[in-house]
């Protein structure tokens, strides 16, 4: 069968959207009117992993291009990047471990950790137009809580 | 230290099982990360990726075995397990158990391997 | 799948030269490639990973460079030691995927 996915914006507790910044990074900053545009629209696919109530794993791909969010070690640290790949393979069922999410929903907010890397995060920092980036602390200063906006 | 050493191979006809065993030491497969994979390789020939299990149980398979093949761990007892069914000709190799961390994967400790022939 | 292609499949060389295996992807691997090292009746011994990063342990001689879908290994100074194949596999996509390998023999 093939995967289920939905396409959506994310916005971190702090409401900043997340843009691209450069042709493999992603930047989180507030957006007003028609610079909402700007925000990118990711394809989640709903893929093979561990499965609970409230956590779902999930890939993270980017609306109409070949780019995944991944997470690989990194000079030793679990590092989030855009990865590319080959469009008539992806997306899958299942997606190599390096892609895969955990789709966790607390309070009506979400979160979004690293299946290879248990304990890290999608977080932003507080301060404006900086990278998003994978976190190894929750409830600290940088950002781990979004909200989810279905796309049409 | 890390060692890694493949059991259960042995002799069987077309259509025969086979559970094969890799028992390891020297790392934990409930430390985050940590992979074993198996990769065989038949007599003169180069080397075949077969299956892959994960920490957290998720498997991996190479395609070209169309299921008939299981991976399997017991954290307890440092031992991961493949399970071959329906062996044909085309599956007698040197069976090799290696640990990897994290993927993209690399190969850092292999077994010595144990010969699976399947012949009538 | 993703078809990697190694070359030459027999290189015959000698003691003291710098000799490079190349393995080409069917497609962009970016850097997931890694080298490994197999003496016949043993199993495989990893020599590089992420393209480029030496394991520890292997001597220095041995490099790796490449990315996208081009890679190769270079050893700058043959010993009697290095005689042996050498196959890459790519962690980019699942199947991962060796090379068909290359033997490196004594002229």
């Known amino acids: 069968a093939p995967v289920r996915s939905l396409h959506c914006t994310l916005r971190d507790a702090q409401l900043k959207s997340l843009v691209m910044s450069g042709p493999y990074e992603l930047k989180a900053l507030h957006l007003q009117g028609q610079d909402l545009e700007q925000q990118v629209v990711f394809s989640m696919s709903f893929v093979q992993g561990e499965e609970s109530n409230d956590k779902i794993p999930v890939a993270l791909g980017l609306k109409a291009k070949n780019l995944y969010l991944s997470c690989v070690l990194k000079d030793d640290k679990p590092t989030l990047q855009l990865e590319s790949v080959d469009p008539k393979n992806y997306p899958k069922k299942k997606m190599e471990k390096r892609f895969v999410f955990n789709k966790i929903e607390i309070n009506n907010k979400l979160e979004f950790e690293s299946a290879q890397f248990p304990n890290w995060y999608i977080s932003t920092s507080q301060a404006e137009s900086m990278p998003v980036f994978l976190g190894g602390t929750r409830g600290g200063q940088d950002i781990t809580d979004f909200t989810m906006q279905f796309v049409s | 230290e890390v060692q890694l050493v493949e059991s259960g191979g042995g002799s069987v006809q077309p259509g025969g099982s086979l559970r094969l065993s890799c028992a390891f030491s020297?790392?934990?497969?409930?430390?985050?990360?940590?992979?074993v994979g198996w990769i065989r390789q038949a007599p003169g020939k180069g080397l075949e990726w077969v299956s892959h299990?994960?920490?957290?149980?998720?498997?991996s398979y190479n395609p070209s075995l169309k299921g008939r093949f299981t991976i399997s761990k017991d954290t307890s007892r440092n031992t991961v397990y493949l399970q071959m069914n329906s062996l044909r000709a085309e599956d007698t190799a040197s069976y090799f158990c290696?640990?990897?961390?994290?993927?993209?994967?690399?190969?850092?400790?292999w077994g010595q391997g144990t010969t699976v022939t399947v012949s009538s | 799948d993703i078809q990697m292609t190694q070359s030459p499949s027999t290189l015959s060389a000698s003691v003291g030269d710098r000799v490079t295996i190349t393995c080409r992807a069917s497609?962009?691997?970016?850097?997931?490639l890694s080298w490994y090292q197999q003496k016949p009746g043993k199993a495989p011994k990893l020599l590089i990973y992420?393209?480029?990063k030496l394991h520890s342990g292997v001597p220095s001689r041995f490099s790796g460079s490449g990315s996208g879908a081009e890679f190769t290994l270079t050893i700058s100074s043959l010993q009697p030691e290095d005689f042996a194949t050498y196959f890459c596999?790519?962690?980019?996509?699942?199947?991962?995927?060796f090379g068909q390998g290359t033997k490196l023999e004594i002229k």
């Open positions: 992420y393209t480029s």
């Open positions: 290696a640990r990897n961390r994290y993927d993209p994967p690399w190969f850092v400790d």
């Open positions: 497609q962009d691997i970016s850097n997931y």
């Open positions: 299990i994960w920490w957290d149980g998720d498997e």
């Open positions: 020297g790392f934990s497969l409930s430390t985050s990360g940590m992979g």
């Open positions: 596999l790519q962690g980019k996509m699942l199947p991962w995927t």
